[in-house]
């Protein structure tokens, strides 16, 4: 059949952050090449990464067409130099990936604190609304535009002079919290999608401390 020494891909794994989505698999090819296909439940399979010796394929362009659809990918293995050959069932060796629903499963990237402002006993912290690779009318959408009210943030903060932490939550990109006048605070934020069952939270942002250059500080 011509596929005697060809092995099927295995350990097919989705890696996705802010909808940038790559399929990875094993093994590193020896005398074989791979082609990837991706489909929604429509079964309209589209080929990508033709006859590649890589063990990853960027499928972002396909999944951002509709991030709420569920996708399946499959990786075909062909003998190097004989990509027309097929297996015993009349088609090339292939393996299916797990299903992947970008809206429910893409990791939310580490958030960034855009700015903070203190006015008296109020501290306003603004989280940068990062762009994703999802487009609408040719324009890249932000996380907020994609997730709407499904996306929230958790602020963890403490006085610079203390280790006792407090948290606050918001469904926007802004926090307004009560603070002690004249005190400096350190804080970080974490994105959260409470409705999810997996990948509910991002990693924490870098910690920002008041009085250390970044942000706007005023009495």
């Amino acid at each position: 059949s011509g596929t005697t020494n060809t092995v099927a891909a295995y350990n097919l794994t989705w890696k996705s952050t802010n909808f940038k989505t790559i399929l990875e698999w094993e093994p590193k090819p020896v005398n074989q090449v791979y082609t990837v296909q991706i489909s929604t439940k429509s079964g309209d399979w589209k080929s990508k990464c033709f006859y590649t010796t890589d063990t990853e394929c960027d499928l972002t362009d396909e999944i951002v067409k509709d991030v709420k659809q569920t996708y399946l990918a499959r990786v075909f293995s062909y003998p190097a130099g004989n990509v027309e050959s097929t297996g015993s069932a009349g088609e090339p060796l292939y393996e299916n990936s797990p299903e992947f629903t970008p809206y429910l499963e893409t990791n939310i990237g580490q958030p960034v604190i855009q700015k903070y402002e203190q006015g008296g006993t109020k501290l306003k912290v603004t989280v940068k609304d990062s762009f994703t690779l999802v487009r609408k009318n040719g324009t890249f959408l932000t996380l907020r535009q994609v997730f709407g009210n499904d996306l929230g943030y958790i602020l963890t903060y403490r006085k610079s002079s203390s280790s006792g932490k407090k948290t606050a939550k918001t469904n926007t990109n802004e926090f307004l919290i009560d603070v002690d006048k004249g005190e400096n605070y350190c804080f970080s934020v974490q994105a959260v999608i409470p409705s999810r069952t997996v990948n509910r939270k991002s990693t924490d942002s870098p910690v920002e401390c008041m009085g250390q250059e970044k942000g706007e500080f005023r009495e």
Partner: antibody, heavy 118, light 106 residues
């Protein structure tokens, strides 16, 4: 509620033709591959054909290749099976099924009976 | 084509019994297997897909296991509604069904 309703079955002579239809409701029809599966009297299930959501990809069992044609009209939420050059061994209940990725069948119609006999 | 062989073809059991049906593929199909239940005069009903994923609305007494070439459908405690014929189906390469296993009252 997701529903599939087949029609068009009946008695036909060997060599004759028949067109089966399957009306779908309760889901976005174009989002799913669809298929036909048949069951001869007292026998097991036999896959016949599958079509992708756009209609651009079609697959057939060897036993019907060249004689049967699967198609769909997404504007009418309807799946079709055109059966030509019918043989006695095509006698069966024909089921229409919703088939995610064209792989397995998660919703089935009640079936329509095709009898090929002189 | 990949052949699917089910055993036994008929199985006699009583309500409350633990029932196991086996399906063997003629070559490896990884986990790309579904199980269906069919009652006389009715359409088949999906129970399990991807070898072990329970379809929504299917009672938890049904479970599937296996990968490669050997698979099992288990009914942990047979109920009166479970007397039916069960089919496996591979979808690794096109689609083929097993010959069926009839579960009848002992």
């Amino acid at each position: 509620e997701v529903q599939l309703l087949e029609s068009g079955g009946g008695l036909v002579q060997p060599g004759g033709s028949l067109r089966l239809s399957c009306a779908a409701s309760g889901f976005t029809f174009s989002d799913y591959a669809m298929g036909w599966v048949r069951q001869a009297p007292g026998k097991g299930l036999e896959w016949v054909s599958t079509i992708s959501g756009s209609g651009g990809l079609t697959y057939y069992a060897d036993s019907v290749k060249g004689r049967f044609t699967i198609s769909r009209d997404n504007s009418k939420n309807t799946l079709y099976l055109q059966m030509n050059s019918l043989r006695a061994e095509d006698t069966a209940v024909y089921y229409c099924a919703k088939a995610p990725y064209g792989y397995y069948m998660d919703v089935w119609g009640k079936g329509t009976t095709v009898t090929v006999s002189s | 084509d990949i052949q699917m062989t089910q055993s036994p073809s008929t199985l006699s059991a009583s309500v409350g019994d633990r029932v196991t049906i086996t399906c063997r593929a003629s070559q490896s199909i990884s986990s790309w297997l579904a199980w269906y239940q069919q009652k006389p005069g009715k359409a088949p009903k999906l129970l399990i897909y991807k070898a072990s994923s329970l379809e929504s609305g299917v009672p938890s007494r049904f479970s599937g296991s296996g990968s490669g070439t050997e698979f099992t459908l288990t009914i942990s405690s047979l109920q009166p509604d479970d007397f039916a014929t069960y089919y496996c189906q591979q979808y690794k390469s096109y689609i083929t069904f097993g010959g069926g296993t009839k579960v009848e009252i002992k």
